[in-house]
């Protein structure tokens, strides 16, 4: 059986300030069981943008219904983009663990750049 891959098809996305940004992510397998998370940045200080399990993410919506059986699409949309949202976003698969889930595989990242709002 092939190991799960995390696919972020766009290396970069450019969005005008005030618009929504769609960041695409797909898995190639339902296994292993465990949540996905989106982060900005890849280092120790990375910021949590979305957690499938829990949390407060008022500007983030999922493009598809994540709880739907056999769903492999974990794309998100971030509303009301500002220049402060620029950065590289990573879709990361975790493997269910006890007591904590364990990071399993990360996508290659999508760089979000923000254009000035059209006048």
């Amino acid at each position: 059986e092939d190991e799960l891959q995390v696919i972020q098809p766009e290396k970069s996305v450019s969005v005008a300030a005030g618009e929504s940004a769609t960041l695409r992510c797909a898995m190639t397998s339902l296994i292993p069981v465990g949540p996905i998370m989106w982060f900005r940045g890849a280092g120790a200080g990375r910021e949590l943008i979305y957690n499938q399990k829990e949390g407060h993410f008022p500007r983030v919506t999922t493009v598809s219904e994540l709880t739907k059986r056999n769903n492999l699409d974990f794309s998100i949309s971030i509303s009301n983009i500002t220049p402060a949202d620029a950065g590289t976003y990573y879709c990361v698969k975790f493997r269910k663990g006890s007591p904590d889930d364990v990071e399993f595989k990360s996508g290659a990242g999508t760089e979000l750049s923000v254009r000035a709002k059209p006048s």
Partner: antibody, heavy 117, light 108 residues
């Protein structure tokens, strides 16, 4: 407005323990890595420890095995348990919020830890 | 561990003059260098990151440059409120995050 308020500092003897707390408000605490930075009198800042959003912990070599960083997202509070304290641990201890690109963008006012016999 | 060396230790200048502060890294940090300002009794305040990007709310008289191992913070026209100690810090992706020893800027 982002606010970070440290507490728990004081005067202790070498070998004793102390637990620092940092109460955070004005941002979604669970979404950001947090760190402790200390500054000895008349010296520059020294990074001490970091806890990531997934609770992975990192330590400076000078405190590894003696200090433990932790977070309670339900209370928006960061902690630093300091054991086997030494005179060279004497410093103002700041907690700071970390940005996605590893910058310390907000700092507390600090709490003074003095280790003296 | 990356060691950051700042020079000079102290800079004494008159209001309106240009201040040039240096930070040298013991190994390359790319552009991942930040500058902080610290006034007595206060916590450090982020000024510059990624070598040359100004943090939110920082006046444009502060500018940064450099890459690799050699970096410069320039204050184009000193004002009395710029009297402080300035620290550089490398902000690569992984700890330890190191700071320089600082440069004290005094206004005559």
């Amino acid at each position: 407005d982002v606010q970070l308020v440290e507490s728990g500092g004081g005067v202790v003897r070498p070998g004793e323990s102390l637990r620092l707390s940092c109460a955070a408000s004005g941002f979604t605490f669970s979404n950001f890595a947090m760190t402790w930075v200390r500054q000895a009198p008349g010296k520059g800042p020294e990074w001490v420890s970091l806890v990531s959003v997934t609770a992975t912990t990192y330590y400076a070599d000078s405190v590894k095995g003696r200090f433990t960083i932790s977070r309670d997202n339900s209370k928006s509070t960061l902690y630093l348990q300091m054991n086997s304290l030494r005179a060279e641990d004497t410093a103002v201890y700041y907690c700071a919020k970390i940005t996605w690109n590893n910058l310390f963008d907000y700092w507390g006012l600090g709490t003074l830890v003095t280790v003296s016999s | 561990e990356i060691v950051l060396t700042q020079s000079p230790g102290t800079l004494s200048l008159s209001p309106g003059e240009r201040a040039t502060l240096s930070c040298r890294a013991s190994q390359t940090v790319g552009s991942k260098l930040a500058w902080y300002q610290q006034k007595p009794g206060q916590a450090p305040r982020l000024l510059i990151y990624d070598s040359s990007s100004r943090a939110s709310g920082i006046p444009d008289r502060f500018s940064g440059s450099g890459s690799g191992t050699d970096f410069t913070l320039t204050i184009s026209s000193l004002q009395s409120e710029d009297s402080a100690v300035y620290y550089c810090q490398q902000h690569n992706d992984w700890p330890p995050y190191t700071f320089g020893g600082g440069t004290k800027v005094e206004i005559k």
